[in-house]
């Protein structure tokens, strides 16, 4: 008799799963030599171990403590860069300024970057067909508690000032619902934090709003002032000329405005 | 079996640039960091930097900072190197390479190298 | 960067004898998980180098057991027990500690 499954509303777990992440955390140690210590194996089998065999609707952050413990790693506190809706440019920023940090330039959201997974109550199945969705299933899901545990635990080790990327294209450019909105904003700690700076990323060439005054911005400000940490806001209105002038500083068309 | 095979010879002039590949085979193109290493005729070997097929993601040497650009096609599983304003000094045999993983462990030397591609920069 | 320093740099051996050759960094290379980051590489005539030895003293798959590495975090030794003719070539080694990885100047070995 075949076994009844479960059907979700989301994509299923992305294919080669194991493999991915195995591989991936090799990668990582390869290329960051100060997280050799990490025994991928065991990264892999506390991975696995937060979601297999558990109900996928019921997933918490403690079933992913073995694995935060695992991969328990130290970024500079005053360099990391949050963002939301605009991963790709935020991923190419922290390409050329080496020395600044988005979660997914950590080992933890490397790992699990762009993947889905989920498992089955009472079989040690990967589920394959189908994961819960966020909206139409669950948000107690592997991959939205994990993403919230690990969002929750890089915002709490932010200090001094902390940067944070928002898509100026978006009709809410900044979104209480987004991950940034939700966790991040809530976790930077107060006696840590001087200043939350927001850099607001225009996607129209003839864009020369000031976006800023945006009322989803001054709603951020606003959460943040009330949580005693200062806000500025800054307007990238050329992002390929932003990120060309961080490649090249010294460029003579980098004093001006981007 | 692994196998890196390299695009053929390149005479250029100084001033010029050059695009080097690297196709790679029996294994899954996006689980394993790309090396590419230089050496000059007579000389030692100079490390110059690494891509991560599947992010994109690259380091370079110092030295090559701005002159250097790696990228990889997933599609073909093909990584290449190019290398701009050349100089007589960049003559040399282009190699990539990449590690061996020792039970879920990289090993930290250059298991696989590719068969080399000498680029002549000469006016 | 660290800077590997190999001795000899050219040495002549007779077939069937023991060959070593030295190697030494300017930073120790043991990492805080217990290896010890050198490699070794034998580069033949006319072709890419071949990994000999990894993590100071661990043979690469396919390499005859006369081939062995061993040394402290500084100083690093690889010996071959009875050369061989085919054993001819460049040898380097490397440090793969950190970035940038080095390679020492290589020794070249001859038969004599």
């Known amino acids: 008799v075949p076994r009844w499954r479960q059907q979700w509303s989301g994509p299923g777990t992305t294919k080669r799963f194991p493999e991915t992440v195995l591989a991936r955390c090799v990668k990582y140690t390869e290329i960051h030599p100060e997280m050799r210590h990490v025994d991928c194996q065991s990264v892999w089998d506390a991975f696995k171990g937060a979601f297999i065999s558990k109900h996928p609707c019921n997933i918490t952050e403690e079933d992913y403590q073995p694995l935060m413990k695992l991969g328990t790693q130290t970024v500079p506190c005053n360099k990391i860069l949050l963002w939301s809706r605009i991963k790709d440019l935020a991923h190419q920023f922290t390409q050329v300024q080496r020395d600044m940090f988005t979660l997914e330039d950590t080992l933890l959201g490397y790992l699990a970057d762009d993947l889905t997974w989920c498992g089955e109550f009472n079989t040690s199945k990967i589920n394959y067909q189908s994961c819960p969705d966020w909206r139409k299933d669950c948000s107690n899901n592997p991959v939205s508690v994990f993403w919230k545990t690990v969002s929750r635990r890089f915002a709490e080790a932010a200090c001094d000032v902390v940067h944070v990327m928002l898509n100026g294209s978006r009709s809410k450019i900044f979104d209480k619902n987004s991950t940034f909105g939700s966790v991040e904003v809530h976790n930077l700690q107060p006696e840590k934090v001087q200043t939350l700076e927001a850099w607001v990323i225009h996607g129209g060439r003839e864009d020369s709003r000031d976006l800023c005054q945006d009322p989803t911005i001054k709603e951020l400000e606003s959460i943040i002032s009330k949580r005693n940490i200062q806000f500025s806001c800054k307007n990238i209105y050329r992002p390929d000329k932003f990120l060309q002038c961080v490649k090249n500083p010294e460029d003579s068309s980098c004093t001006s405005e981007i | 079996q692994v196998q890196l095979v390299q695009s053929g010879a390149e005479v250029k002039k100084p001033g010029a640039s050059v695009k080097v590949s690297c196709k790679a085979s029996?294994?899954?193109?996006?689980?394993?960091?790309m090396h590419w290493v230089r050496q000059a005729p007579g000389q030692g070997l100079e490390w110059m930097g690494w891509?991560?097929?599947?992010?994109?993601?690259?380091d370079y040497a110092q030295k090559l900072q701005g002159r250097v650009t790696m990228t990889a096609d997933t599609s073909t599983s093909t990584a290449y190197m190019e290398l701009r304003s050349l100089r007589s000094d960049d003559t040399a045999v282009y190699y990539c390479?990449?590690?061996?993983?020792?039970?879920?462990?990289?090993?930290?030397?250059?298991?696989?190298w590719g068969q080399g591609t000498l680029v002549t920069v000469s006016s | 960067d660290i800077v590997m320093t190999q001795t000899p740099l050219s040495l002549s051996v007779t077939p069937g004898q023991p060959a070593s050759i030295s190697c030494q960094s300017s930073?120790?290379?043991?990492?805080?998980?217990?290896?010890?980051?050198l490699n070794w590489y034998l580069q033949k005539p006319g072709q890419p180098p071949q990994l000999l030895i990894y993590?100071?003293?661990t043979r690469a798959a396919g390499v005859p057991d006369r081939f062995s590495g061993s040394g402290s975090g500084t100083d690093f030794t690889l010996k071959i027990s009875r050369v061989e003719a085919e054993d001819v070539g460049v040898y380097y080694c490397?440090?793969?500690?950190?970035?940038?990885?080095?390679f020492g100047q290589g020794t070249k070995l001859e038969i004599k």
């Open positions: 390479a990449r590690v061996a993983i020792i039970t879920t462990v990289a090993s930290g030397g250059f298991a696989y």
């Open positions: 029996g294994y899954t193109f996006t689980d394993y960091i």
């Open positions: 891509i991560d097929p599947e992010y994109g993601s690259t």
């Open positions: 930073e120790s290379l043991l990492h805080s998980n217990g290896k010890t980051y």
């Open positions: 993590w100071m003293s």
């Open positions: 490397q440090q793969f500690l950190e970035y940038p990885p080095t």
